[in-house]
Interface confidence: low
Amino acid sequence: IWELKKDVYVVELDWYPDAPGEMVVLTCDTPEEDGITWTLDQSSEVLGSGKTLTIQVKEFGDAGQYTCHKGGEVLSHSLLLLHKKEDGIWSTDILKDQKEPKNKTFLRCEAKNYSGRFTCWWLTTISTDLTFSVKSSRGSSDPQGVTCGAATLSAERVRGDNKEYEYSVECQEDSACPAAEESLPIEVMVDAVHKLKYENYTSSFFIRDIIKPDPPKNLQLKPLKNSRQVEVSWEYPDTWSTPHSYFSLTFCVQVQGKSKREKKDRVFTDKTSATVICRKNASISVRAQDRYYSSSWSEWASVPCS
C-alpha cells in the first residue's frame, strides 16, 4: 500500500481467483484513543473499533472511503483504491490502446516546435467517475522540471454505438534549450482513477521524436499563363521554431483528384513554392516536416484547384 495523495491510498493486488489479497492497517488520524469506530462508504455498519482497523483487501468491495468516528463526529477518512496486477502485468482497463505507433500505446504526445512545450492525449470509453493527474520530468534519476497543466476533456467521438472520450494535457519544460541535442528523454506519468480503480500510464520520448509541425500557412495558387500549371506558394507556420534558417522545414505538395482512387501527384521541396499541374476537380495540399530529422509530417493545408 502507498499514498497517492493525502488520505488516498493505493493497494496493489495480484488479481486472480481466490487470491489472498493484502492485509491493510488503517490508523485514525486523531489524538483520541478510545471510543473510535470505523465504517465504509455510506454504510452505518460498524466494521471495527479502536484507533486502528485491520482489513483484508481482496476485491473492489473492500475498497472505498473508510471513516473513523467518535460519538457521531467524523475524525478522519482514508480512501482505498485498488491497482490490479494480472499475470504480472498491471491492468490497463481505463484507457484505450491507441495502437499507434505500436501496440500498447496509451499516451500519445506531440510538439509543434522545439520550445519544450508539448501536448499529450489519451482515449477512454468511460464518461463518469474519472480523474487524471499528470506529472512529467526530463530524465528519471536526476529529474529536471517539466510543468503540466490539468488534464481536460478535449473531444468526444462516436464509434458505432459507442462514445470515445479524448483527454489532453499541455506541458512545458521549465528550462528548455531548443537548439540543444537531447540526451535524456522526457518522462510523462498519468495517474488514472475510475471509481475505486487506480492505474498508471507512462510515456518516454525525446521532443525531437514527437515533433509535428502545424500545417503551412497562407497557401496560395498563382495560375501560369497558357498552361494548366499553377505556382503554389506557402509560408512556415507561425508556431514553428525560429530562426527558420536553423530550424528548417521540408514540404510535400500533393495534387489530389476528387476520387481517392485517382493517382496522386507528389512533389517534395525545401522551398516555399512549387509548380504543379492542376487537374480538373483536384485540390492541392501541402504539408511540412522537419528537414533534418524524420519526425511526423504536419496535417495537410489544402486549397481547391479551381
Epitope: T92, D97, R159
Partner: antibody, heavy 122, light 111 residues
Framework: EVQLVESGGGLVQPGGSLRLSCTVS????????MNWVRQAPGKGLEWVGA???????AYANWAKGRFTISRDNSKNTLYLQLNSLRAEDTAVYYC????????????????WGQGTLVTVSS | DIQLTQSPSFLSASVGDRVTITCQSS????????LSWYQQKPGKAPKLLIY???TLASGVPSRFSGSGSGTEFTLTISSLQPEDFATYYC???????????FGGGTKVEIK
C-alpha cells in the same frame, strides 16, 4: 487457454429462427470485441456483425433487422439470433474474438471457433 | 457498400515461388492500416497472419509479410512452402463499423 466453441446449428425451414451460441473461456467478454462471420458452402468469408467490449453492436448492412448479436458475460457466452431465415443463409457460422483487448470493430480477428453449420431447407 | 477486391481469385504456383496477393478497398480503411490477412484450409477455421496491414501475428513464419496503406494492400509469401497452399482473405475495418468486410479470397493451388 483461450477457447471459443459454437453450438446451436442445424436444419431449419425457410422463415424459421435459430439461436447460435459461442461459449468462450480463458478471457472475459467484457474486454473483447466479438464477431460473427459466416461462410456459405464453397464460398468466401462474410462478416455478419460484432458486439463491442462495451456492448455496442454493428451489423453488415445485409444482416440488419434479421440478425441480432447479444452476450451474457456471466455465462461467458455470445449469441447470434437468426430470424426469417432463407436458403442463402445456409453456411458455417464462426465466432471470432477481436485480437486486442478493447479492439475496434473491424480490427483483426483471433482466435476463431471451429464453426457451426446452419442449413436452411424445406 | 464498401468493396474489398482481392486479386487474383486463383493462383497456381510452385513450392519456392514468390507469391503476391493484392487487396484493394473502395474506401480508405480506418487510420490507413486497419487491415488484416487470414489463411484458411479446407474444413478449418481461418487463421490470422497479418494485422495492422504489416504486423506479423505471433507464430506466423517470417516468409509472410504485409504492406500497404489506405486503400491498397499486399500479402507476400517470399518462398511458398507445401503447407501454404490454402485460401487467403483480407479484412478491412472502416470509420463506420458497419462497413467491416472481407475480400473475396484468393485460392493458392499447386501448379
Amino acid at each position: 487457454e483461450v477457447q471459443l466453441v459454437e453450438s446451436g446449428g442445424g436444419l431449419v425451414q425457410p422463415g424459421g429462427s435459430l439461436r447460435l451460441s459461442c461459449t468462450v473461456s480463458g478471457f472475459s467478454l467484457s474486454t473483447y470485441t466479438m464477431n460473427w462471420v459466416r461462410q456459405a458452402p464453397g464460398k468466401g468469408l462474410e462478416w455478419v456483425g460484432a458486439i463491442s467490449y462495451d456492448g455496442g453492436t454493428a451489423y453488415a448492412n445485409w444482416a440488419k433487422g434479421r440478425f441480432t448479436i447479444s452476450r451474457d458475460n456471466s455465462k461467458n457466452t455470445l449469441y447470434l439470433q437468426l430470424n426469417s431465415l432463407r436458403a442463402e443463409d445456409t453456411a458455417v457460422y464462426y465466432c471470432a474474438r477481436g485480437f486486442y483487448v478493447y479492439a475496434y470493430i473491424g480490427d483483426a480477428f483471433d482466435p476463431w471457433g471451429q464453426g457451426t453449420l446452419v442449413t436452411v431447407s424445406s | 457498400d464498401i468493396q474489398l477486391t482481392q486479386s487474383p481469385s486463383f493462383l497456381s504456383a510452385s513450392v519456392g515461388d514468390r507469391v503476391t496477393i493484392t487487396c484493394q478497398s473502395s474506401q480508405t480503411v480506418y487510420k490507413n492500416n486497419l487491415l488484416s490477412w487470414y489463411q484458411q484450409k479446407p474444413g478449418k477455421a481461418p487463421k490470422l497472419l497479418i494485422y495492422l496491414a504489416s504486423t506479423l501475428a505471433s507464430g506466423v513464419p517470417s516468409r509472410f509479410s504485409g504492406s500497404g496503406s489506405g486503400t491498397e494492400f499486399t500479402l507476400t509469401i517470399s518462398s511458398l512452402q507445401p503447407e501454404d497452399f490454402a485460401t487467403y482473405y483480407c479484412l478491412g475495418g472502416y470509420d463506420d463499423d458497419a462497413d467491416t468486410a472481407f475480400g473475396g479470397g484468393t485460392k493458392v493451388e499447386i501448379k
